[in-house]
């Protein structure tokens, strides 16, 4: 059962796992949610009736029954983790805490103009978990405007105390706001020889990398595969750090793989969701339950639905035994990973999918692409929407992309002459324009947010957000596309598609069926040569064939340039301007979305 509200002046008795310090009960709930075992918590707020050493304590708790006895206690705030909930969860915390000093290891001290600058510095520093900033009014002259970057083993403060004229806050890495590089490569036959901060068991290097990503201190990792010569180290995932933030030594070793934390890419690739099955593999751990199940998929479902289950092993039924049902072992451990991994015993193992909701919805795999042809099929581009105007008569106006459950990203130039959002309708999950009838459901538009530097498409800033009146329920035919990570600026995308109903201003003919065209990206330098009278800025991206043979008219203004990278689709561009439709075959010019990620997040996350 999902319980989101906090219980004031209430304490849960017993079930303690560990105690951490958090600046608020709300953040305590987030910490509990991300902890592998925590189901309930009790937070102590500052209060004259409480011992100051207990202020800001966040006690993480577990219970076999998923609940604990409640006791009345002033200043105590209790609640449940969001593990039991189905809604999207985020660790992003933009709050600034006034007059609080969050203690940790102060490893960097520098002058900053503001708390915001200090927070940005923390976000762009690989080691930083949180910061404390002494304001202009701080009594000690030599400490004024000092920005202290801090880290701890747990990622949360070791203590929190009251201190006048300082402010504290957390790194915004988990808000996708870091400019740190996103290095997705996994290096085969490589060992990073740096200090280990932790070790866990993992079935493969990808899971090891994801564990490293959500471990607060892990910057890179080394994984020993099941073929590793030393038996006791097989399937061992070593979580590592270094002072520089990079591996100091790389050793060539067969059957080992190494890689980096994906903390700067976490909004555009799954880091919590381990969805694969591992055949002929047994995961050992504390047994929670043994249930009969028809298949390993059914076993995974049972694990996902059992809130305390972290991983499972399924042993298929022996012929004609137990109505063809196998045994599903639901398991858990102190850190969410198996205590040992065994091979060759015939089991099929995997992880709960409950953690998938901690990843961005946009990372969910969509159904395979239909190769060839120019007409799309249903569900092929589930983020594509058709934006209609109802004035003077209803017609398709522009394309757009779902980027959140209340947000559509499109082009600013679509709204020339649009006086009010009331005349706009957003249709999602549409393949053919002819499907749209009087009674077809649509999303009304609450607000049009146009970039304030926009003047005309050709000058850039051709980007706009539509805030919908109601939220989109994600399904196979309507779901979001990931924004590119800022750490991905140097990625070379090779699998890019432009989609739309083929409508361009001045060309009234629209296609009934959603069209698609695979087009290569063109360097800005090459593109600039093709558009000598227009400045191709770094905030634009160009795509299209050097020479004829591909109809670049498939995209609508405002629609997506979608690129697949590491099995995840990213919204790399927004169809903006260009001469792709005419005989000229110049590349199309698109708004370069990665350059607007901060703007998008600022607008969509505004309270």
């Amino acid at each position: 059962e999902c319980v989101t509200q906090l219980l004031k002046d209430t304490c849960f008795e017993g079930g303690d796992i560990t105690t951490v310090f958090t600046p608020s009960a709300k953040y305590c709930q987030v910490v509990c949610t991300y902890h592998p075992r925590c189901l309930l918590f009790t937070f102590t707020a500052e209060s004259p009736s409480e011992d100051p050493t207990r202020w800001f304590t966040c006690v993480l708790k577990d219970s076999v029954t998923e609940t604990l006895p409640r006791v009345n206690r002033t200043a105590a705030i209790s609640g449940y983790s969001f593990k039991q909930c189905s809604h999207q969860i985020s660790a992003c915390n933009k709050d600034i805490y006034v007059d609080l000093d969050m203690k940790g290891i102060n490893y960097n001290s520098s002058v900053a103009k503001s708390a915001q600058e200090c927070q940005e510095r923390c976000t762009d520093d690989v080691h930083c978990h949180f910061f404390t900033y002494a304001t202009r009014q701080f009594p000690s002259l030599e400490h004024r405007n000092i920005c202290l970057l801090k880290h701890t083993q747990t990622g949360t403060p070791t203590r929190i105390t009251k201190l006048d004229k300082v402010v504290s806050g957390f790194s915004l890495k988990s808000c996708a706001l870091s400019n740190l590089a996103c290095i997705r490569d996994i290096f085969p036959n490589t060992v990073f020889a740096d200090s280990n901060i932790d070790s866990v068991m993992a079935p493969d290097a990808f899971v090891c990398g994801r564990i490293c990503t959500h471990h607060p201190g892990c910057l890179f990792f080394t994984f020993f595969s099941q073929e590793w010569p030393k038996e006791s180290q097989r399937n061992l995932c070593l979580l590592k750090t270094s002072e520089s933030g990079l591996p100091s030594t790389r050793i060539k070793k067969s059957k080992a793989l190494s890689g980096f934390s994906l903390q700067s890419c976490r909004h555009s690739i799954p880091v919590f969701c381990h969805s694969s099955f591992y055949h002929d593999t047994d995961f050992l751990g504390e047994e929670l339950d043994i249930v009969a199940a028809k298949s390993h998929e059914a076993c995974q479902k049972l694990c996902t639905n059992a809130v305390r289950c972290q991983f499972f092993t399924y042993t298929p039924a022996q012929a004609s035994c137990n109505e063809g049902k196998g045994k599903c072992y639901l398991k858990l451990s102190s850190n969410g990973s198996p205590t040992k991994i065994l091979h060759g015993r015939g089991g099929i193992s995997g992880y709960t999918l409950r953690l998938c909701k901690m990843d961005n919805e946009c990372t969910t795999k969509i159904k395979p692409r239909i190769v060839g042809g120019t007409a799309s099929v249903r569900g092929e581009w589930p983020w594509q929407v058709t934006l209609h105007t109802t004035s003077p008569t209803q017609r398709h106006l522009c394309g757009g992309s779902i980027i959140g459950n209340q947000w559509i990203l499109t082009a600013a130039h679509c709204f020339y002459g649009v006086e009010s959002p009331k005349i706009l309708r957003v249709y999602s999950g549409i393949l053919n324009q002819s499907e749209i009838k009087e009674d077809t459901s649509f999303f009304g538009v609450q607000e049009i947010i146009i970039h304030d530097q926009y003047k005309m498409a050709e000058s850039g800033y051709d980007i706009a957000l539509l805030k919908l009146e109601t939220t989109v329920n994600y399904t196979d035919s309507q779901r979001p596309i990931c924004l590119p990570s800022k750490g991905d600026r140097n990625v070379i995308y090779t699998d890019c598609w432009v989609t739309g109903w083929g409508y361009r201003k001045l060309r009234d003919k629209i296609q009934n069926t959603l069209q698609k065209a695979k087009i290569p990206l063109v360097t800005n330098e090459e593109c600039q040569k093709r558009y000598r009278g227009h400045k191709i800025t770094h905030k634009m991206i160009c795509a299209g064939y050097r020479e004829g043979g591909k109809d670049a008219c498939k995209g609508d203004s405002g629609g997506p340039l979608s690129c697949k990278h590491n099995e995840v689709w990213h919204l790399v561009g927004i169809t903006s301007w260009g001469e792709g439709c005419a005989q000229r075959e110049r590349p199309g010019v698109y708004t370069n979305v990665v350059e607007y990620v901060d703007w998008i997040l600022e607008k969509t996350q505004a309270v």
């Epitope: 005309m456 050709e458 000058s459 600039q528 040569k529 093709r530 558009y531 000598r532 009278g533 227009h534 400045k535 050097r546 020479e547 004829g548 260009g578 001469e579 005419a582 005989q583 000229r584 075959e585 110049r586």
Partner: antibody, heavy 120, light 107 residues
Framework: QVQLVQSGAEVKKPGSSVKVSCKAS????????IEWVRQAPGQGLEWMGV????????NYNENFKDRVTITADESTSTAYMELSSLRSEDTAVYFC?????????????WGQGTTVTVSS | DIQMTQSPSFLSASVGDRVTITCKAS??????VAWYQQKPGKAPKLLIY???NRYTGVPSRFSGSGSGTDFTLTISSLQPEDFATYFC?????????FGQGTKLEIK
């Protein structure tokens, strides 16, 4: 009808500058690019640069980059080309031209040309 | 920069002749090729754009063809007013460049 009318002939000393004007009429001035092309006596055509009157964006041929400045005044629908540090090799007929397409392309309308003579 | 090499530089022909002028680009220029006619003391006039499209008011005896790097301007039956200098131009990549010209004279 579309017309581009250029300023009259100029005689200039080496080292000085010349500014040639090109007044457009008969179309929406800010919607098309204005190019400048020159032709030395008995020679071919050489592109000097372009201006987008709508945005003010200019792009110059590397050969002239440090010496040429192209501007446009939307209020009078007039484009200007200024060439500095003149030398005798700059003696030529200077043409302004409009591009056929919004984004560049062939040059469909040309001014009558302005003869610039550089001589000491 | 893309070089446009025009040939021949000079061409003598008679009224009624069929004439062909060629232009070779130093690299592929897609379909971004135009042809101009220029008479002494006058500005160039656009004849053909996008390789083969005749500009408004240009007689049908003028035609363009080619692809990639090799392009041709053909005048099917020379008229007295066609004696002039002809230039090809690529518009594929900045800076736009012109051929050196073909002077068509009366034989």
């Amino acid at each position: 009808q579309v017309q581009l009318v250029q300023s009259g002939a100029e005689v200039k000393k080496p080292g000085s500058s010349v500014k040639v004007s090109c007044k457009a009429s008969g179309y929406a001035f800010s919607n098309y690019l204005i190019e400048w092309v020159r032709q030395a006596p008995g020679q071919g055509l050489e592109w000097m640069g372009v201006i987008n009157p709508g945005s003010g964006y200019t792009n110059y041929n590397e050969n002239f980059k440090d010496r040429v400045t192209i501007t446009a005044d939307e209020s009078t629908s007039t484009a200007y080309m200024e060439l500095s540090s003149l030398r005798s090799e700059d003696t030529a007929v200077y043409f302004c031209a409009r591009t056929y397409g919004k984004y560049g392309g062939a040059m469909d309308f040309w001014g009558q040309g302005t003869t610039v003579t550089v001589s000491s | 920069d893309i070089q446009m090499t025009q040939s021949p530089s000079f061409l003598s022909a008679s009224v009624g002749d069929r004439v062909t002028i060629t232009c070779k680009a130093s690299q592929s220029v897609s379909n971004d090729v135009a042809w101009y006619q220029q008479k002494p003391g006058k500005a160039p006039k656009l004849l053909i754009y996008y390789i083969s499209n005749r500009y408004t008011g240009v007689p049908s005896r003028f035609s363009g063809s080619g692809s990639g790097t090799d392009f041709t301007l053909t005048i099917s039956s020379l008229q007295p007013e066609d004696f002039a200098t002809y230039f090809c131009q690529q518009d594929y990549s900045s800076p736009p460049t012109f051929g050196q010209g073909t002077k068509l004279e009366i034989k």
